[in-house]
Structures are given as structure tokens and as C-alpha cells.
């Protein structure tokens, strides 16, 4: 039988955006495979990603059951083929992940400006309410459904002809802002959760700019 010893996983890292949650680890396996287990603090260990040679495991299905729970994962290493294990008899090698609380730690994905529409000297800017993989009553919840009023959007807007940015905030997905007639404006939005200590801002959206509104304004 082989002489390459089984090694424990290391650098266990949670990668999570809008609750899509993947556990990653090292090393790339040589003569070994991995199985991942996930648990809540009070729950039981559930195996996922059985006997895999991947170094990542999608745990979204488990964490979306309760995004406010704190989860812990562990990665077991098993010898592949006829390779001896370094674990003491009956003791499989495993490594624990850091704790992970999805509601507090999932990264906010880059938001998308869905539309903007001018009404007189006001512009209504709508942010797309992104669907998550969190389910309730067999339907997928949006980011707003999950975070409610904890989720704030900041709008950055400026005249195309100048660099001075203005900001607006909303705890819905819509902004109504005042603009100058006949001017082109550019918009970018960012999701923010002020109640978080870390990881509280998303990347800014792709900037979208208006075209000349003269026809819209009837000039």
C-alpha cells in the first residue's frame, strides 16, 4: 500500500455573497479526498460534498435554512485508494472552519440600477431587488425580504458635466431626487447595512447615465 500520508485541510474560508455560500480550503488533494460537515451551534453535523477531490463545497442549501444562525463547518480528510492514514486508529483527520453567521457576514453583491424615469424636475431611480437563495413557503426571497429595513441603498448622482457628487439614501428600493432641467445625470448605487460592524457595504453598481432629456421635457 502507498506511503503518502493523509493531511488535514487548512485555510478554511467562507466565501459568501447574497447568501450564496461556499466553503473553501487547502491543499489540493494528493491521494486523499474530503467530506465536509456543517452544523449550527446547537444542531447536528450534516455531511455534504462526499468523498470529493474539490477544495470547495457549496453549503448554501444548509445556511439558507436559517440565515441568522451561526454555523461551523469541518473538513474531513480520507485516504484515497490504498494509502495509509495519519489519523490515530478510528480518528479521522479534520479541521474546523471559523464560525459564520450569514445574516451578519454574507457579502452584499453589486447592486443593479433597474431603471430611472423623469417626472418633471424629479427623477425616480429604482434599484433591482435581487433574488437570493433564501426560501420561505417555497418561494425565493429577495434581498429586501431578508434584510428588511436593515438594508439601505445609497445613491450617488452627479451632473455629467461636473464631478461634484450628491448622495441620497433610502430604506426601500426607490429614490426620488431633484434634478435640473435639461441636464444629463449619472447614477451609481451602493447597498449598506449600518447595523453591521464589518462587511457592511456592497461594491458600487455600474454607473448609468441619462441621455438628453429635451424631448422628455418637451423642449
Amino acid at each position: 500500500s502507498g506511503t503518502t500520508n493523509t493531511v488535514a485541510a487548512y485555510n478554511l474560508t467562507w466565501k459568501s455573497t447574497n447568501f450564496k455560500t461556499i466553503l473553501e480550503w487547502e491543499p489540493k488533494p494528493v491521494n486523499q479526498v474530503y467530506t465536509v460537515q456543517i452544523s449550527t451551534k446547537s444542531g447536528d453535523w450534516k455531511s455534504k460534498c462526499f468523498y470529493t477531490t474539490d477544495t470547495e463545497c457549496d453549503l448554501t442549501d444548509e445556511i439558507v435554512k436559517d440565515v441568522k444562525q451561526t454555523y461551523l463547518a469541518r473538513v474531513f480528510s480520507y485516504p484515497a485508494g490504498n494509502v495509509e492514514s495519519t489519523g490515530s486508529a478510528g480518528e479521522p483527520l479534520y479541521e474546523n472552519s471559523p464560525e459564520f453567521t450569514p445574516y451578519l457576514e454574507t457579502n452584499l453583491g453589486q447592486p443593479t440600477i433597474q431603471s430611472f424615469e423623469q417626472v418633471g424636475t424629479k427623477v425616480n431611480v429604482t434599484v433591482e431587488d435581487e433574488r437570493t437563495l433564501v426560501r420561505r413557503n417555497n418561494t425565493f426571497l429577495s434581498l429586501r425580504d431578508v434584510f428588511g429595513k436593515d438594508l439601505i441603498y445609497t445613491l450617488y448622482y452627479w451632473k455629467s458635466s461636473s464631478s461634484g457628487k450628491k448622495t441620497a439614501k433610502t430604506n426601500t428600493n426607490e429614490f426620488l431626487i431633484d434634478v435640473d432641467k435639461g441636464e444629463n445625470y449619472c447614477f451609481s448605487v451602493q447597498a449598506v447595512i449600518f447595523s453591521r460592524k464589518t462587511n457592511h457595504k456592497s461594491p458600487e453598481s455600474i454607473t448609468k447615465c441619462t441621455e438628453q432629456w429635451k424631448s422628455v421635457l418637451g423642449e
Partner: antibody, heavy 121, light 107 residues
């Protein structure tokens, strides 16, 4: 339809080796793990190991480590289980069973018909 | 290895009776448990997966449940064709292990 067809019965002497085949049909061979389970006469079921047909990676129960080798031939959708250094207590029916994938439950939903291996001097 | 203690090892019941088999895991295995039926001279057949999910095509008189490390398999109304040995199997920990089996006979 989905099925697993195994090779015929074998009679072997102690110390010899036996190689049992299991041909899969009716589904995408690479998408499901294959397991080997054995059953001694009048006894219960015992899991021997698993092979991932996609990459050929195997994991064996410690009891069989060093004596069992599982391989696959993707061109014929066939998996093989070779057990060496046979002894009388290896007399059993050997089953291949399709069971899950890396993301699915390891439930054996399709079984071969079984191959009787008799070890006798 | 995880020990799966199945009981009783055999039972005799009348047609139409409710039959219950239990399987106890030596440690927490979540709901990672399957139930199989094996008729004499045949390969096992999957009936229940993940403790309580009925495999496609399996009659609804078969059911499974979990309470902690205790798992229960029930035949709500025993039929003559249910004469077989039933096995539980856990897959939450390596190596995968089976219970010792329960032989069900008709009185």
C-alpha cells in the same frame, strides 16, 4: 432502463484473487458514485468502498485497505472490484450499487444482481 | 466506526398489522440514514432515504422518522409481499455502515 449487470459466480482458493465486474447502463456513468457492498451467507450487509467513475478516485473501508482495488473503464461504463489474499471468510455475495454523487445523499438506489464468490480449498 | 443497532432482529406479525423497526446510531448522524428491503436471494432495494423521504415508486405504507439518534421505520399495514429483511444504513460518517437487519415474517 437503469441497470447494473455483474459478472458470474466465482470459486477461488485461499490466497488467490478475484475480480468482479459491474456494467452500468441507462444513465450517465460518470455522474454517480459506485459502491461495493458484500453479504456473507446468512449475514448482514457490509460496505467495502466507493469509486468515483468520473476521476477514478477510490475510498475503501479500513478493513479492506491494502486488499481491495476498485477500478473503472469509462469506455465500457464498467467498474471492477478486485479482492486479493482471499480467505474463507471472504465467501460472500458481492454487490455493486449506484449511490449518490458528491452533492447527493449516499443512498444506494440501483443494485447489481450480486456475484457469489466462494473461497474454498 | 458508527454502530447502527437495529431492533428487533426478527419479528412475526399478521397481515394488516402495523410493524415498527428501530435503528439507533452510536452518535449523531443528522438525518443521513436510509432504509432497504431485501427479499431472499435478491439484491436490497432502497425504500427510504434521508430518514423520511420515500423513494420513487415505493408504496406509501412504508415510512421513516427520526428522533435524535433514534430512527424508526414503519409499515402501516403489513402485506404478504413485505416478507423480507430490512436494513438501515448511515452515510454521515466514513465508513458507511449498516444495521444488523430485521427479518419480518407473517404469522
Amino acid at each position: 432502463q437503469v441497470q447494473l449487470v455483474q459478472s458470474g459466480a466465482e470459486v477461488k482458493k485461499p490466497g488467490a484473487s478475484v475480480k468482479v465486474s459491474c456494467k452500468a447502463s441507462g444513465y450517465t456513468f460518470a455522474n454517480y458514485y459506485m459502491h461495493w457492498v458484500r453479504q456473507a451467507p446468512g449475514q448482514g450487509l457490509e460496505w467495502m468502498g466507493i469509486i468515483n467513475p468520473s476521476g477514478g478516485i477510490t475510498v475503501y473501508a479500513q478493513k479492506f485497505q491494502g486488499r481491495v482495488t476498485m477500478t473503472r473503464d469509462t469506455s465500457t461504463s464498467t467498474v471492477y472490484m478486485e479482492l486479493s489474499s482471499l480467505r474463507s471468510e471472504d465467501t460472500a455475495v458481492y454487490y455493486c450499487a449506484r449511490g449518490g454523487s458528491k452533492v447527493a445523499a449516499l443512498a444506494f438506489d440501483i443494485w447489481g444482481q450480486g456475484t457469489m464468490v466462494t473461497v474454498s480449498s | 466506526d458508527i454502530q447502527m443497532t437495529q431492533s428487533p432482529s426478527s419479528l412475526s406479525a399478521s397481515v394488516g398489522d402495523r410493524v415498527t423497526i428501530t435503528c439507533q446510531a452510536s452518535q449523531d448522524i443528522s438525518n443521513s440514514l436510509n432504509w432497504y428491503q431485501q427479499k431472499p436471494g435478491k439484491a436490497p432495494k432502497l425504500l427510504i432515504y434521508d430518514a423520511s423521504n420515500l423513494e420513487t415508486g415505493v408504496p406509501s405504507r412504508f415510512s421513516g422518522s427520526r428522533s435524535g439518534t433514534d430512527f424508526t421505520f414503519t409499515i402501516s399495514s403489513l402485506q404478504p409481499e413485505d416478507i423480507a429483511t430490512y436494513y438501515c444504513q448511515q452515510y454521515n460518517f466514513h465508513p458507511l455502515t449498516f444495521g444488523g437487519g430485521t427479518k419480518v415474517e407473517i404469522k
